[in-house]
Amino acid sequence: QRKRRNTIHEFKKSAKTTLIKIDPALKIKTKKVNTADQCANRCTRNKGLPFTCKAFVFDKARKQCLWFPFNSMSSGVKKEFGHEFDLYENKDYIRNCIIGKGRSYKGTVSITKSGIKCQPWSSMIPHEHSFLPSSYRGKDLQENYCRNPRGEEGGPWCFTSNPEVRYEVCDIPQCSEVECMTCNGESYRGLMDHTESGKICQRWDHQTPHRHKFLPERYPDKGFDDNYCRNPDGQPRPWCYTLDPHTRWEYCAIKTCADNTMNDTDVPLETTECIQGQGEGYRGTVNTIWNGIPCQRWDSQYPHEHDMTPENFKCKDLRENYCRNPDGSESPWCFTTDPNIRVGYCSQIPNCDMSHGQDCYRGNGKNYMGNLSQTRSGLTCSMWDKNMEDLHRHIFWEPDASKLNENYCRNPDDDAHGPWCYTGNPLIPWDYCPISRCEGDTTPTIVNLDHPVISCAKTKQLRVVNGIPTRTNIGWMVSLRYRNKHICGGSLIKESWVLTARQCFPSRDLKDYEAWLGIHDVHGRGDEKCKQVLNVSQLVYGPEGSDLVLMKLARPAVLDDFVSTIDLPNYGCTIPEKTSCSVYGWGYTGLINYDGLLRVAHLYIMGNEKCSQHHRGKVTLNESEICAGAEKIGSGPCEGDYGGPLVCEQHKMRMVLGVIVPGRGCAIPNRPGIFVRVAYYAKWIHKIILTYKVPQS
């Protein structure tokens, strides 16, 4: 059985409206039905109606149809408000433009292209013809209106009233010529109801053939009238769901208006230094996401293919690789130059209503003189003059007292990661302040990353490791347990401190965590004699974007044959390329019968430039990252290894040079791994160990 087409899409709906006939000669037909769709089908087919149906009203209260041979534009008729009524008018009778060849045109134009009045179809004067209304039922050969009953090239036409000119086409524009939009058509409220390939659009208030979330009542400001093309979601141009079950949606062919200006109401407030609202009007030059990964150019398709191009979004200022919000997202964002991270928010751009005087710093912020006096966790800063003793304890020069006024965020110790302050909270003696580096400030904090200037090893004679690695050589390896299961790795860098990754702490309740030390088996089998189980007493989050955490143990680990600490590298050091390193972890191995034993993968250090090339130039590494490639294809860190160390040896001394963090994929063949560069954060680690109180053993 052939499925009857749903014809309600051919009608324009006016909610809470009915038509009242002033002319008593006008006919009406009524019948009880269940849905407006049933009314529409009967109106379109004129089944059982003594007239050509041009409109109908659905009475929702009485479940009744009222079919009309007229519409709201007809004489002898007036519109009236009525809660229970919905008026549906056949678009063909109210449209003043044509679709394709204009076969369905039923408008009232009755003058030809050259201005001659049309001859009525029922008349044989001045031209005899066979196009009688009775022979072309449904083609609406009424009065002397232009029509195209056979769908011929050239569009609607008529026989003319001029005996010298038999017939001529009428000058009725294509709907795609009449309709136009500004920008990407987000404010378009026109009547285009078919796609660029000619498919009829699905009504927004219908869920067939395609289910969707854009319900008119849910989005009253999006103009979801009937089945007209709209752009509710920041696409390049208006679109609609189609009536073709095999084509979910398609763009509509709506040209850009000649005078391409936006209405005043559509223009977001433009800002360059901060974000107003969701930042749709942000026009500044920040071009990295929150964690420092550079943005991809909007006019580039590498490393990420997309359609958010300057051509598609003409009014969104998609210049260069600046953070923008062209699609109504939460805040400005961009595609990133990291192939593994498609997009990221530029959440480091401050909100306009959160400005605190000078709210950005240059370099490392040692000259910052703004008046912010709150840490990133919301603690109020304490006065500098109350903390001078503590400050002297970890810097070896006299701080500039003239800069340390009140309790403002400052950087008296040349911290690489920006202004900070003391808090007066004994658990958190100090913390960084929520200030970003100024836009366009590219001053590096460490120079010459790929040239070994500073050795990473503290001394050449510290510790000698003979022969092949044994269990005792991995005593610094920590299994972080979350609700009794292994979740991440970590490195014991001091008796009370474990270095790991920020993402390893899904819960804020420290009772949910334990640290297991001295084990080789992830379940602790056979490790009973050597295993130490320690609670976690505090998490100290690394500088913004570092992805590092220092986890403080509730009591110090006991160093023995099975538990040992691992050394940190010198701040800002570089390890030579091709240095052999290892990553350790109890994570996913790719094996079905995983035995739970600590695994090691051997990697070698790769310079940042070469690493970028291995990632096909799609990744630009910054000074806080280190790269190491696998000796064996497909080996490297994966889930469960996060937080664990990249361990390298220099001058016979083993150090933790990197930390495994999510977001770089699992052991991808021919793609070197990218780790957090511990040397970049070494000063921060030392400062925490020096200033945070730990329990005595």
Epitope: D327, P506, S507, E639
Partner: antibody
């Protein structure tokens, strides 16, 4: 985020719902599943964190399984019962761990009936 | 377990009035609490996070307060558009949690 896979199933027929994400990365944000039975309140089911670890509500443990790929998060219901009839939402968690939900999908309806 | 109890289950308020909804945690969750608004047929919408911070685009007539175990959502100068169900959610820990959400409060605007 957008959910898919909701449909009418018989009790005991396994069902998998999929949450497809775009505009952000699953290596930056956790994803949570929440359901709402007709005319009832929100009921948290579980969460998958950035590091791949999952947590479930105590009643949902063993009844549901959450897993992910690079752009999708699946909720498997191995043996649905009529009590599992609900609209299922996936929501983006503000951070890599447990936090508030700052982006919700429109929901997908699951009807379990014989 | 960190379970949430929300009161009242339903409240009626006149346009322009003030409505207060309370949420109690079974143990301290510091300031890790969020509030959501849900209208029929729609997904929930984030209103407030970290107990008192207003989410982007939320009108200032909504405010949140509290810490530890007691939290309050206040809607001042209620508008017709505020008719909805409101839910609290703890963002602290999900260990042994039955439901991270409170039971919901229906706000009826007269």
């Amino acid at each position: 985020v957008e959910e898919s896979g909701g449909r009418l199933v018989m009790p005991g027929t396994p069902l998998t719902l999929t949450c497809t994400v775009s505009g952000f990365s699953l290596s930056s944000n956790a994803i949570s599943w929440v359901r709402q039975a007709p005319e009832k309140g929100l009921e948290w089911i579980g969460v998958i964190y950035v590091i791949g670890v999952t947590d479930y509500a105590s009643w949902a443990q063993g009844r549901f399984t959450i897993s992910k790929t690079s752009t999708t998060v699946d909720l498997k219901i191995p043996s649905p019962t009529t009590e599992d009839t609900a609209t299922y939402f996936c929501a983006r968690v503000y951070d890599s761990g447990w936090n508030h939900f700052n982006l919700w999908g429109p929901g997908t309806l699951v009807t379990v009936s014989s | 377990a960190y379970d949430m109890t929300q009161t009242p289950a339903s409240v009626e308020v006149a346009v322009g009035g003030t409505v207060t909804i309370k949420c109690q945690a079974s143990q301290s969750i510091s300031s890790w609490l969020a509030w959501y608004q849900q209208k029929p047929g729609q997904p929930p919408k984030l209103l407030i996070y970290e107990a008192s911070k207003l989410a982007s685009g939320v009108p200032s007539r909504f405010s949140g307060s509290g810490s530890g175990t007691q939290f309050t959502l206040t809607i001042s100068g209620v508008e017709c558009a505020d008719a909805a169900t409101y839910y609290c959610q703890q963002a602290y820990s999900v260990a042994n949690v039955d439901n991270a959400f409170g039971g919901g409060t229906e706000v009826v605007v007269k």
